[in-house]
Interface confidence: low
């Protein structure tokens, strides 16, 4: 039988009446056009909805937009377009919502051709009021908030000027010209690249990387011959042109660009690219594109300094620069990532790692599934997950994989069961243990979302026909109930729930069409009465993450420690609540070779946990460039994996000696660095 139809599925009592009393419809007085939605703050219930409609006239396009505000999680909306003087808002800039719970919002307005600068509307009270401000420049990018201080904004102008505001957009100052890319770093630092000659495009590979730590009073050039730069975790990366040819290499800094080291990664040519797939304060996943138009490359994982890299996964699917990759961080379980590889026969297969890129394996076949036509052996196959690449290829996949940090262990994704990803219509699968085991959850493609930290999963069938039914599960997708939320079906466009999966409200967005008109409509359903009581201690059970063999003493050890969680029992129908905090008990494991990556000059042969010396470096002194000094490395080949907390056990020797010699690694040496003040 299909999932959720087994007799043992307990019914949620009287749910139709409970949900009917908590279903709120709002019809927007708009022609259809486009709609964008933003949540303002965390747990505030404030939603802003911007609808825009373009009327193509003979000479120009005339646009109109409307702004709506809800303060009850979308149950009711108020038209507040008059607060922005009925101005047309540019949707390509979106709604710039301030960090944390600052309550700040910036909307960028469309202005007439001859104006001196752009116009913004600013709110610092969760969009209750807006102030109109005329800009001394035309913005090229959305306003970017400093993560540390929401009063500090930066923007690039259409003239490539870098503009900064220190008073939440009231007053603006151009701090630098000829800027290509600018990003906030930590401590209100701004990093940006500049061109000297023609333009960003013409000077690519000859750009300079600058830093200001005082919002433009003084500057320091921290890099030359720059192609691009990126920030990830505590790492600053720059791809730098080599002296002699057109190749470039990654350099990394962990001190905001004061000192740089060359990353032990392959150099890339003109047609290739580097991409930071994921980064945290411990390490980085770096994709290095293969030469030629292969559509794949190699994933490398870094050490704690971002300098020494281990090959993690070959033939990693990643189409051209800025293209598609299926790389997904499973946020519901530490150390888990899913991605796709392009095999020799050009089929695409899903791989999963449970130890932050140390080892990759296929996903285990779901027990309640048959192998499809792609499988050579009908009894042996794997689950393959549809992600960004499938969506880009217009397969019938409405959503990427979903996981939430506070819904421990839960991963929901579209997939197919065989030897490779199938172009057939996918089903929806769920894992409740972070990707180790999977179960078919729903037949056919669906939209899905997680509410109440995993206490409720909501899904809507993906269909070209109008819909009026929502499905929900209170037991992590084992059993499903269906609820008809409206008599008149709507053309469904999206599910919206507050980021963080703590809410119990879901908004279903769509439009209605009648003979003469088309209107936006939303239905917000509050599940609070389905989960009638607050969860108690008895509703939770202990779960050991990453447990694969309860008989093994080291069961659950990943990156040197294991974690035991309190998780909601599937049979408990209760509210985790908005204040729910994941309860976990970590414990340290003894070190084994698995807790170490291979050091500079060493590699791991396949299916071996020992690191052996690279043949080309055998007998050579291991000397490498670090922070602009030459270092001598004494090692037996191992370096602790970033973030690994193991103690005791195996303890390989490692020592780095400063050779007191300068080296520049094709990059800036300190004497080349210059500072200047405005």
């Amino acid at each position: 039988s299909a999932p959720g139809e087994d007799e043992e599925c307990g019914r949620v009592r009287d749910f139709v009446a409970k949900l009917a009393n908590n279903t709120h419809q709002h019809v927007f007085d708009d022609l259809r056009g486009s709609v964008s939605l933003s949540w303002v703050g965390d747990s505030t219930g404030v939603i802003l909805v911007l609808t825009t409609f373009h009327v193509p006239l003979v000479i120009m396009t005339f646009g109109q937009s409307k702004l709506y505000r809800s303060e009850d999680y979308g149950k009711n909306f108020k038209d507040i377009t008059d607060l922005i003087n009925n101005t047309f808002i540019r949707t390509e800039f979106g709604m710039a919502i301030g960090p944390e719970n600052s309550g700040k919002v910036v909307l960028t307005a469309e202005v007439s051709g001859g104006s001196r600068g752009g116009r913004i509307f600013r709110s610092s009270d969760f969009a209750k009021n807006f102030v109109q401000t005329d800009l001394p420049f035309h913005p090229l990018t959305q306003m970017m908030y400093s993560p540390q201080n929401s009063d500090y904004l930066l923007a690039l102008s259409t003239e490539n000027g870098l503009w900064v505001s220190k008073n939440f957009g009231g007053k603006w100052e151009e701090i630098h010209k000829a800027v290509c890319l600018a990003k906030w770093g930590s401590d209100n630092t701004i990093f940006f690249t500049t061109y000297a000659n023609g333009s960003c495009k013409a000077d690519l590979g000859a750009l300079e990387l600058w830093r200001t730590s005082d919002l433009g009073k003084s500057f320091k050039t921290i890099g030359v011959k720059i192609y691009s730069f990126g920030l990830g975790g505590r790492f600053l990366f720059a791809s730098v042109m080599a002296d002699k040819d057109t190749t470039r290499r990654i350099h990394v800094s962990t001190d905001q660009g004061d000192t740089w080291s060359m990353a032990q990664l392959p150099s890339v040519g003109q047609e290739q690219f580097y991409s930071i797939l994921a980064a945290n304060d411990d390490m980085v996943f770096m994709h290095v594109d293969e030469p030629g138009d292969t559509g794949f490359g190699t994933i490398f994982t870094s050490d704690d300094r971002g300098i020494v890299y281990s090959k993690s996964l070959d033939r990693h699917l990643y189409t051209t620069t800025g293209g598609e990759t299926d790389f997904t961080n499973v946020t519901s379980l530490r150390g888990v990532y899913i991605t796709s590889v392009l095999s020799e026969d050009n089929s695409i297969q899903t791989m999963i790692t449970f130890d932050q890129g140390g080892r990759w394996t296929h996903l285990r076949k779901p027990e309640n599934s048959e192998c499809d036509a792609t499988a050579k052996n009908k009894n042996e196959c794997s689950l393959h997950i549809h992600a960004s690449y499938s969506i880009s290829q217009k397969l019938n996949v409405p959503m990427a994989p979903l996981s939430e940090p506070n819904a421990v262990g839960i991963v929901i994704a579209h997939g197919s069961v065989g030897d490779a990803i199938s172009v057939m219509v996918p089903d929806v699968y769920i894992s409740d243990d972070g990707g180790y085991s999977w179960t078919k959850m729903l037949e056919g493609p669906h939209y899905y979302t997680i509410l109440d930290s995993g206490g409720i999963i909501v899904a809507i069938e993906h269909s070209s026909r109008p819909i009026n039914v929502i499905k929900f599960s209170t037991d992590e997708g084992q059993c499903w109930q269906t609820y008809t939320f409206t008599r008149d079906p709507i053309y469904f466009t999206g599910l919206a729930s507050e980021p963080g999966a703590r809410s119990m409200n879901i908004s279903i967005w769509g439009f209605t069409e009648s003979f003469l008109t088309s209107q936006w409509v939303s239905y917000t359903i509050d599940f609070k009465d389905i989960l009638e009581r607050n969860c108690e201690e008895k509703d939770y059970t202990i779960w050991l993450a990453h447990s694969t063999d309860p008989e093994d003493y080291e069961d659950g050890c990943i990156l040197g420690y294991k974690e035991q969680f309190l998780r909601l029992r599937k049979s408990s129908v209760c509210q985790n609540g908005r204040d729910y905090v994941v309860t976990k008990q970590p414990s340290i494991c003894l070190c084994s070779l698995e807790d170490f990556l291979c050091d500079f000059g060493y590699y791991r042969p396949e299916n071996d946990s020992k690191c052996v010396e690279q043949p080309e470096l055998k007998g050579h002194d291991l000397e490498f460039c670090l922070y602009g000094r030459e270092e001598h490395l004494t090692t037996n080949g191992y370096r602790k994996i970033p973030g690994d907390k193991c103690q005791g056990g195996v303890n390989p020797v490692r020592e780095v000696k400063d050779l007191k010699k300068k080296c520049t690694s094709n990059f800036l040496s300190p004497e080349k660095q210059n500072s200047k003040s405005n």
Epitope: L544, Y553, E554, S587, Q647
Partner: antibody, heavy 124, light 107 residues
Framework: QVQLVQSGAEVKKPGASVKVSCKAS????????MHWVRQAPGQGLEWMGI????????SYAQKFQGRVTMTRDTSISTAYMELSRLRSDDTAVYYC?????????????????WGQGTTVTVSS | DIQMTQSPSSLSASVGDRVTITCRAS??????LNWYQQKPGKAPKLLIY???SLQSGVPSRFSGSGSGTDFTLTISSLQPEDFATYYC?????????FGGGTKVEIK
């Protein structure tokens, strides 16, 4: 019931080696670590090292590094500790002790089941 | 290596007394501390693991507390069979180390 039975007392000359065995019964031998601890006459307890469930993993206290070898034979559920180059101050009672685990959860490597001890006397 | 210091090294008490033994680690060991009881000529017996969890089969008059560097074993009402030597042991960092022991004697 769960128990660890150790081999009998040994008298050795300085410079010789001793191999103490520890036979487990009443539980899945391959699911637990085994510690070795010794106690000199009138003294406290001294940890010597640990061997993993499958025997592939060992960790020894620095003091015994190079002199101690811990092994296990899973086919007969027996762990062994061999100490070489014996000295008179190696005279002690040697214990094997099972590493505690509880419902698949690490409990900080307490030792919940102990052997009866093997007295090793080193004397010329 | 982490040093484990037990105090007192010996104490005299009567049946029914409340007895407290302390153990101090030379650096933080979180809650990775275990307590053992040893009687003459016998192997040690695990009483408390992870600082405060009572090992099954151990009478509830034994309790443990503490985390970081300071830990306590308490016997709420001393019984005749409790006269023995008690050891603390850390398992946070290799090598595992034991305290010097506390001998509980009859007054």
């Amino acid at each position: 019931q769960v128990q660890l039975v150790q081999s009998g007392a040994e008298v050795k000359k300085p410079g010789a080696s001793v191999k103490v065995s520890c036979k487990a019964s009443g539980y899945t031998f391959t699911s637990y670590m085994m510690h070795w601890v010794r106690q000199a006459p009138g003294q406290g307890l001294e940890w010597m090292g640990i061997i993993g469930p499958s025997g592939g993993y060992t960790s020894y206290a620095q003091k015994f590094q190079g002199r101690v070898t811990m092994t296990r034979d899973t086919s007969i559920s027996t762990a062994y500790m061999e100490l070489s180059r014996l000295r008179s101050d190696d005279t002690a009672v040697y214990y094997c002790a099972r590493g505690k685990r509880s419902s698949g959860w690490y409990e900080g490597y307490g030792m919940d089941v102990w052997g009866q001890g093997t007295t090793v006397t080193v004397s010329s | 290596d982490i040093q484990m210091t037990q105090s007192p090294s010996s104490l005299s008490a009567s049946v029914g007394d409340r007895v407290t033994i302390t153990c101090r680690a030379s650096q933080s060991i979180s809650s990775y501390l275990n307590w053992y009881q040893q009687k003459p000529g016998k192997a040690p017996k695990l009483l408390i693991y992870a600082a405060s969890s009572l090992q099954s089969g151990v009478p509830s008059r034994f309790s443990g507390s503490g985390s970081g560097t300071d830990f306590t074993l308490t016997i709420s009402s001393l019984q005749p069979e409790d006269f023995a030597t008690y050891y603390c042991q850390q398992s946070d960092v290799s090598p595992i180390t034991f305290g010097g022991g506390t001998k509980v004697e009859i007054k």
